[in-house]
């Protein structure tokens, strides 16, 4: 039943070129190269892509031509290794080129940098962008792919093609509008925010596959697809999971051409079989390919079938529980997960996986016991505290969010997480806590039945950002422990951390709290980040500071910024009032 079984092709590069078409082929090769060599200039990448494309065309004309039988990894790796400045720019990554495939590709993958040292993307004036778009549309769009791909080396490549299509549409429409800025800027903001979210979600999928293995990813996919397609039978869900796992394994492994091709095949299969999958797919399946795949990935959950029987009969009361577990462990656990998930769209995927893990652990123990049935008879009772923990946490945090609003809620989380893991770098703590805080506006507006899947699965994505950033420069054993022990228990692990009593407070440095007039010209978001950076530093200096003390200092700081930004001589105000503020803060915190 595999969608992806194809006849062997003499030339893999010709096969993919023909399947994808020249435009998508070139775009995907550019993404692949930019995700591997993140520091290379745009022009160098374009040159490499053009060379690969010309070579692919010779293979399309004659699949038996020289080198056309080589694997894509060999062809692309050889091309990347021709870059003259590899050693100077990338250091030890150049050693990858001494290796043979598949080790060479694995080596490139290991050197992908989640936080590359690249300048922040600054958005030019609208007229400047529209001129660039009109002057050379192709180069303008390639530049977009390149800049996103190099900053997000795990971005889901076929989805990036969809973003690029929307980016092009925005410029096509808005550069002709009467008020170009009013038309374009909200669209670009939306693409930026959606793009960051898409990147983070895909990063979790790749981390799941690479750090915890295919079984972990498949379990996640069974749970999510069973919630989304509760009318589909288990065999259908299993088939979709197998195919989806192949697609994501390819994309996470840098096999972007195969990934995009297989994703298109999967979308085609889903649309051809929507009657046995979901009633919600009709609109998606009428769209063009890129929109169709995106739409399917985001489609709402179908309605649950009526009168689903209790799970207890088959998974607790049946005489065959241990026989099923012994004969086909993973299939039986998969069935349990499928049956539980399709009945519980109100649970987060990670909660469903915790329940399945509890069920597995219980059977592992009980099926070896003298009276297995007596041993596992109460297994469903063990689920109650696991369900209540995230429910209570979400209730408490949504109440706090509604009381404080997003900015102050983020600040509460900044303090909470800095106290838990003060060794983590300030920019990482600010970024992660800001994102954790966004769970409020994103999820607390939902009714109870949608809050948990929204909140806890979003938190898994954000905490994975912390994990991948921390993995690059490990500084905290507690972060390492929570990140590596269990994928599904990461959030409960971080929630359970208390103040780190072993932490030695950071030395006070007045420079950290010295501000200048440039803060006045920053956007509201940038100004918030400056204040939140100061808040993290305060907590690092005084981890035992109370909420009241920190609030008082932050209120004084806000007043100080407001006052000096209204002053005639802003710089003098910041210098003089800043010294007073630092002294007052030190006194207030007993530094």
């Amino acid at each position: 039943r595999g969608v992806f079984r194809r006849d062997a092709h003499k030339s893999e590069v010709a096969h993919r070129f023909k399947d994808l078409g020249e435009e998508n082929f070139k775009a995907l090769v550019l993404i692949a190269f930019a995700q591997y060599l993140q520091q290379c200039p745009f022009e160098d990448h374009v040159k490499l892509v053009n060379e690969v494309t010309e070579f692919a065309k010779t293979c399309v004309a004659d699949e038996s031509a020289e080198n056309c039988d080589k694997s894509l990894h060999t062809l692309f790796g050889d091309k990347l290794c021709t870059v003259a400045t590899l050693r100077e720019t990338y250091g030890e990554m150049a050693d990858c080129c001494a290796k043979q495939e598949p080790e060479r590709n694995e080596c490139f993958l290991q050197h992908k940098d989640d936080n590359p040292n690249l300048p922040r993307l600054v958005r030019p004036e609208v007229d400047v962008m529209c001129t660039a778009f009109h002057d050379n549309e192709e180069t303008f769009l390639k530049k977009y792919l390149y800049e996103i791909a190099r900053r997000h080396p795990y971005f889901y490549a076929p989805e990036l093609l969809f973003f690029a299509k929307r980016y092009k549409a925005a410029f096509t429409e808005c550069c002709q509008a009467a008020d170009k800025a009013a038309c374009l800027l909200p669209k670009l903001d939306e693409l930026r925010d959606e793009g960051k979210a898409s990147s983070a979600k895909q990063r979790l999928k790749c981390a799941s596959l690479q750090k915890f293995g295919e079984r972990a990813f498949k379990a996640w996919a069974v749970a999510r697809l069973s919630q989304r397609f509760p009318k589909a039978e288990f065999a259908e869900v299993s088939k979709l999971v197998t195919d989806l796992t192949k697609v994501h394994t390819e994309c996470c492994h840098g096999d972007l051409l195969e990934c995009a091709d297989d994703r298109a095949d999967l979308a085609k299969y889903i649309c051809e079989n929507q009657d046995s999958i979901s009633s919600k797919l009709k609109e998606c399946c009428e769209k063009p390919l890129l929109e169709k795949s995106h739409c399917i990935a985001e489609v709402e959950n179908d309605e649950m079938p009526a009168d689903l029987p209790s799970l207890a009969a088959d998974f607790v009361e049946s005489k065959d529980v241990c026989k099923n577990y012994a004969e086909a462990k993973d299939v039986f656990l998969g069935m349990f997960l499928y049956e539980y998930a399709r009945r519980h769209p109100d649970y987060s995927v990670v909660l469903l996986l915790r329940l399945a893990k509890t069920y597995e652990t219980t059977l592992e123990k009980c099926c070896a016991a003298a009276d297995p049935h007596e041993c596992y008879a109460k297994v469903f009772d063990e689920f109650k505290p696991l369900v209540e923990e995230p429910q209570n946490l979400i209730k408490q945090n949504c109440e706090l969010f509604e009381q404080l609003g997003e900015y102050k809620f983020q600040n509460a989380l900044l303090v909470r997480y800095t106290k838990k893991v003060p060794q983590v770098s300030t920019p990482t703590l600010v970024e992660v806590s800001r994102n954790l805080g966004k769970v409020g506006s994103k999820c607390c507006k939902h009714p109870e039945a949608k809050r948990m899947p929204c909140a806890e699965d979003y938190l898994s994505v954000v905490l994975n950002q912390l994990c991948v950033l921390h993995e690059k420069t490990p500084v905290s054993d507690r972060v390492t422990k929570c990140c590596t022990e269990s994928l599904v228990n990461r959030r409960p692990c971080f929630s359970a951390l208390e103040v780190d009593e072993t932490y030695v407070p950071k030395e006070f440095n007045a420079e950290t709290f010295t501000f200048h007039a440039d803060i006045c010209t920053l956007s509201e978001k940038e100004r918030q980040i400056k204040k939140q950076t100061a808040l993290v530093e305060l907590v690092k200096h005084k981890p035992k500071a109370t909420k009241e003390q920190l609030k008082a200092v932050m209120d004084d700081f806000a007043a100080f910024v407001e006052k000096c930004c209204k002053a005639d001589d802003k710089e003098t105000c910041f210098a003089e009032e800043g010294k007073k503020l630092v002294a007052a803060s030190q006194a207030a915190l007993g530094l």
Epitope: E233, A235, D314, S318, D320, K323, A328, M335
Partner: nanobody, 123 residues
């Protein structure tokens, strides 16, 4: 509980074909293993064919290549297509089901049974 009702039995000449059907009700059975057994007069009930959740089929050696078991989960039915019938295929044919991942071949492993349908093959 699962209720099973067989249909399609009858009298057929040797070399002919017959199709049996088994309709399940009471609860969804798409993940259940389903099987056909038969019992000739004065003999033990014997395994004929079984099919599991992912439509993997197994057959008794005596019917391999002649009988085909299939399932339609949308209709909650299991079918047995019998070709090249022989007089020794004469028996009461029973449909059975159980929640097992791997379809068993032993009658005692099955929890739910139909009332049976008579198949007679004349020479």
């Amino acid at each position: 509980q699962v209720q099973l009702i067989e249909s399609g039995g009858g009298l057929v000449q040797a070399g002919g074909s017959l199709g049996l059907s088994c309709a399940a009700s009471g609860r969804p059975v798409s993940n259940y293993a389903a099987a056909w057994f038969r019992q000739a007069p004065g003999k033990e009930r014997e395994f004929v064919a079984a099919i599991n959740w992912n439509k993997t089929a197994t057959y008794a050696d005596s019917v391999k290549g002649r009988f085909t078991i299939s399932r339609d989960n949308a209709k909650s039915t299991v079918a047995l297509q019998m070709n090249s019938l022989k007089p020794e295929d004469t028996a009461v044919y029973y449909c059975a089901a159980v929640f097992r991942v791997v379809a068993p071949k032993t009658q005692y492993d099955y929890d739910y049974w139909g009332q049976g349908t008579q198949v007679t093959v004349s020479s």
